[in-house]
């Protein structure tokens, strides 16, 4: 399940001068590079969790400049231009602003941390080269995070970290189709920690998605469920305060 | 065939209420957020909201979030959108549409509002 | 709310020739744009959506184009039947909205 390709071997179908995976070209921005808040709207939505937003502000000691992460994230609507300087993303793959859909207060108010479980949209479903990047905080003593690409009633893509399963650490991934789970891919690599901040980034391929965490590239997981275009939503849960969630192309 | 067939059209009084269907097929209907859609006479487009039908959870454009309410039969494979206190500001085509990016669109139901 | 502004209200041509419609939106987007033709007493009909992809049936002379925060639909060769109205519309990020449209009619 796992590999040894990148972000950058993905988009450029070159090799990497950057073997860890994911590169920092666009990875670790440092703070004051400027980023891209995503669009926000305000007040609640019935069906929604209650009020939260993001891009909120990155918890100390998570990743600035990444979509939906804002350090002093300015009022909804407000739109800073793109990075320059040291951080500043690539002309060839600039990423875009991300998308959003938070259930913010009145305009203007201050982001606050998303309501776990949180379900991201994906209206018009995913698509190759749309990354998606979620930021937040492992719980201490987390016993699970899952996340959940969901159609319909079925679940595409569930990437499953396990904290201790059978004294074990673990990721499972699978898909659930029909209410009936699949086979089970597993990874023993684990870069969670209990207690401590987490990107993560999915970027969806086309015969499979990509997963790197912390910048680092994770795992990959083929395709099973064919129609991406009917993969509408992103359940996030499990033991974690959530930052952000966010989805922009690249 | 992807179908979105809806309810036909309505004449109501000011402060009434009016509940419009959207039936779809030719499609998994819980697989596809379905989108409101209001022309005025002569107007441009305005998104009302859109609600999940696998699990109902609904988004509202903030000018119509005390004016719509989105619901759904999934059983049947029935949108529906209530719209309450009509006024003729209300009067209008509303169009049920398929997924983000609206590909399949229904016929259309014009709601006149007059006393 | 994002803003989608399409500059021109009414282009001119004839059957024939080349033309491109413009659509700005007033925040980076990232490709979640379609295209919609309207004739009069029709439903909006779905040309292209991810700002480029030609939907199901859709002509080959309809093509799309644009990234960030400006998009353009190209009808290479206009036909008769083309003459509407056409609106763009973005499905980026709540509420989502359409430009207020262009409409296209003959010289």
């Known amino acids: 399940m796992a590999d040894n390709f990148s972000l950058h071997d993905a988009l450029s179908g070159s090799g990497n001068p950057n073997p860890q995976g994911w590169p920092g070209a666009w990875g670790n921005q440092p703070a004051g590079a400027g980023g891209y808040p995503g669009a926000s709207y305000p007040g609640a939505y019935p069906g929604q969790a209650p009020p939260g937003a993001y891009p909120g502000q990155a918890p100390p000691g998570a990743y600035p400049g990444a979509p939906g992460a804002y350090p002093g994230a300015p009022a909804p609507g407000v739109y800073p231009g793109p990075p320059s300087g040291p951080g500043a993303y690539p002309s060839s793959g600039q990423p875009s602003a991300t998308g959003a859909y938070p259930a913010t207060g009145p305009y203007g108010a201050p982001a606050g941390p998303l309501i776990v479980p949180y379900n991201l949209p994906l209206p018009g479903g995913v698509v190759p080269r749309m990354l998606i990047t979620i930021l937040g905080t492992v719980k201490p003593n987390a016993n699970r995070i899952a996340l959940d690409f969901q159609r319909g009633n079925d679940v595409a893509f569930h990437f499953n970290p396990r904290f201790n399963e059978n004294n074990r650490r673990v990721i499972v991934c699978n898909t659930k189709l029909d209410n009936n789970w699949g086979r089970e891919e597993r990874q023993s690599v684990f870069p969670f920690e209990s207690g401590k901040p987490f990107k993560i980034q999915v970027l969806v391929e086309p015969d499979h998605f990509k997963v790197a965490v912390n910048d680092a590239h994770l795992l990959q997981y083929n395709h099973r469920v064919k129609k991406l275009n009917e993969i509408s939503k992103l359940g996030i849960s499990g033991d974690i305060d959530l930052t952000s969630a966010s989805y922009t192309m690249i | 065939q992807v179908q979105l067939q809806q309810s036909g059209a309505e004449l109501v009084r000011p402060g009434a209420s009016v509940n419009l269907s959207c039936k779809a097929s030719g499609y998994t209907f819980t697989n596809y957020w379905m989108n409101w859609v209001k022309q005025r006479p002569g107007q441009g487009l305005e998104w009302v909201g859109m609600?999940?039908?696998?699990?109902?959870?609904?988004h509202y454009n903030q000018m119509f979030k005390d004016k719509a309410t989105l619901t759904i039969d999934k059983s049947s494979s029935i949108a529906y959108m209530q719209l309450s206190s009509l006024t003729s500001e209300d009067s209008a085509v509303y169009y049920c549409a398929r997924w983000g990016a609206m590909d399949y669109w229904g016929q259309g139901t014009s709601v006149t509002v007059s006393s | 709310d994002i803003v989608m502004t399409q500059s021109h209200k009414i282009m001119s041509t004839s059957v024939g020739d080349r033309v491109s419609i413009t659509c700005k939106a007033s925040?980076?987007?990232?490709?979640?744009v379609a295209w919609f033709q309207q004739k009069p007493g029709q439903s909006p009909k779905l040309l292209l959506y991810w700002a480029s992809t030609r939907h199901t049936g859709v002509p080959d002379r309809f093509t799309g184009s644009g990234s960030g925060t400006d998009y353009t639909l190209t009808i290479s060769s206009v036909q008769a039947e083309d003459l509407a109205l056409y609106y763009c519309?973005?499905?980026?990020?709540?509420?989502?909205?359409f430009g207020s449209g262009t409409k296209l009619e003959i010289k």
């Open positions: 609600i999940d039908p696998s699990d109902s959870e609904t």
């Open positions: 925040q980076d987007v990232s490709t979640t």
């Open positions: 519309q973005q499905h980026y990020s709540p509420p989502f909205t």
